[in-house]
């Protein structure tokens, strides 16, 4: 898998998952994004993939969550620590993952069809600087 293409596909899936409301979005999951600043990408991807794997046990799997899990796993450490005490909803987890992935995508200088998405996200968060 090409890293940039994988990130792009993950963002697309997250766009769909966060656009659709269902009871599964209220599931409580571990807030794995409160990790220290020096946590590696591979560790964060592993933690996020672990959360998604746990969702399967709640009968809440669909093809976008499955695809997301496969893509994250392809870029992640094989094992990771999951010591988080804090919790969040699945919807908040996916929204935060989307922001993280968008940042990674733009950092790699790829801003073709996601330019509109980036602007929309910036306006929503009241940021008006340009990358």
């Amino acid at each position: 898998h090409n890293f940039n293409i994988t990130i792009k596909e993950i963002i697309k899936m997250l766009n769909i998952l966060t656009a659709r409301n269902d009871s599964c979005m209220e599931l409580t999951v571990k807030d794995v994004f409160t990790a220290p600043k020096n946590t590696s990408d591979k560790e964060i991807f592993c933690r996020a993939a672990t959360v998604l794997r746990q969702i399967y046990t709640h009968n809440c799997s669909n093809r976008y969550l499955r695809g997301l899990y496969r893509n994250l796993s392809s870029m992640a450490n094989k094992t990771c620590s999951m010591n988080e005490i804090k919790k969040s909803t699945l919807k908040d987890f996916l929204e935060r993952l989307k922001v993280i992935m968008q940042k990674k995508y733009y950092r790699h200088g790829l801003n073709d069809i996601f330019e509109a998405q980036k602007i929309e996200w910036h306006e929503h968060h009241h940021h008006h600087h340009h990358h």
């Epitope: 596909e9 697309k12 659709r20 409301n21 669909n62 093809r63 695809g67 998405q117």
Partner: antibody, heavy 124, light 111 residues
């Protein structure tokens, strides 16, 4: 060979109910999300509903939310669409469709196999 | 009212090429591109290709796709009689949280 065989279409009065069925064969039914799409006379295709592989979650178009219910029986390899409070504008050919699973280069926003369609006519 | 806009009809002669456009917005095609389907009357719609050109096995390479911003185009070269059908584009719309289809384009083969 993937096959989706539909049944249940009929002539029904406004306000009436109908249940459509779609029997799947040739693939692992319990591993795929499934959808219903319709084609009304003189109109284009319209997506109606989706159900995840395990039966939850489910999703609906605004036009049918609260009136139609999608369900599945993985033991019987069958997908259902329960249609209540039917209106004249629900007259259409209804298709069941298998949602494409994510594979590299095909991210899953498509429907790769469709049933033959079943006609639902809502008229007094 | 379809979210994606297609011409109602296009026509071409045997052996010629035609292009069918499908236009959307930043909420659908601009993010996800689109998928194309071929629909013959009385038959099941058939998955034809992704806008980026990915084709399932069995679809001839006479069918190709391209995308540009919020629009996609289906190209069919060396037209054959059996290509006469309705063609639909489809995407996902983040505002609606739903799959959306184009209004459909009827392809007529002349002569």
């Amino acid at each position: 060979e993937v096959q989706l065989v539909q049944s249940g279409g009929d002539l029904v009065k406004p306000g009436g109910s109908l249940r459509l069925s779609c029997v799947a064969s040739g693939f692992a039914f319990n591993g795929y999300d499934m959808d219903w799409v319709r084609l009304a006379p003189g109109k284009g295709l319209q997506w109606l509903s989706e159900i995840s592989s395990s039966g939850s979650p489910t999703y609906y178009a605004d036009a049918v939310e609260g009136r139609f219910t999608i369900s599945r029986d993985n033991a019987k390899n069958t997908l259902y669409l329960q249609m209540d409070s039917l209106r004249a504008e629900d007259t259409a050919v209804y298709y069941c469709a298998r949602a494409g699973e994510y594979t590299y280069g095909y991210e899953g926003y498509y429907f790769d196999y469709w049933g033959q369609g079943t006609l639902v006519t809502v008229s007094s | 009212q379809s979210m994606l806009t297609q011409p109602a009809s296009v026509s071409g002669s045997l052996g010629q090429r035609v292009a069918i456009s499908c236009s959307g917005s930043t909420n659908n095609i601009g993010i996800f591109g689109a998928t194309w389907y071929q629909h013959l009357p009385g038959k099941a719609p058939k998955f034809l290709l992704y806008s980026d050109g990915n084709r399932p096995s069995g679809v001839p390479d006479r069918f190709s796709g391209s995308d540009s911003g919020n629009s996609v185009t289906l190209m069919i070269t060396a037209l054959q009689a059996e290509d006469e059908a309705d063609y639909y584009c489809q995407s996902f719309d983040t505002t609606l949280g739903a799959y959306v289809f184009g209004s459909g384009t009827q392809l007529t083969i002349l002569g």
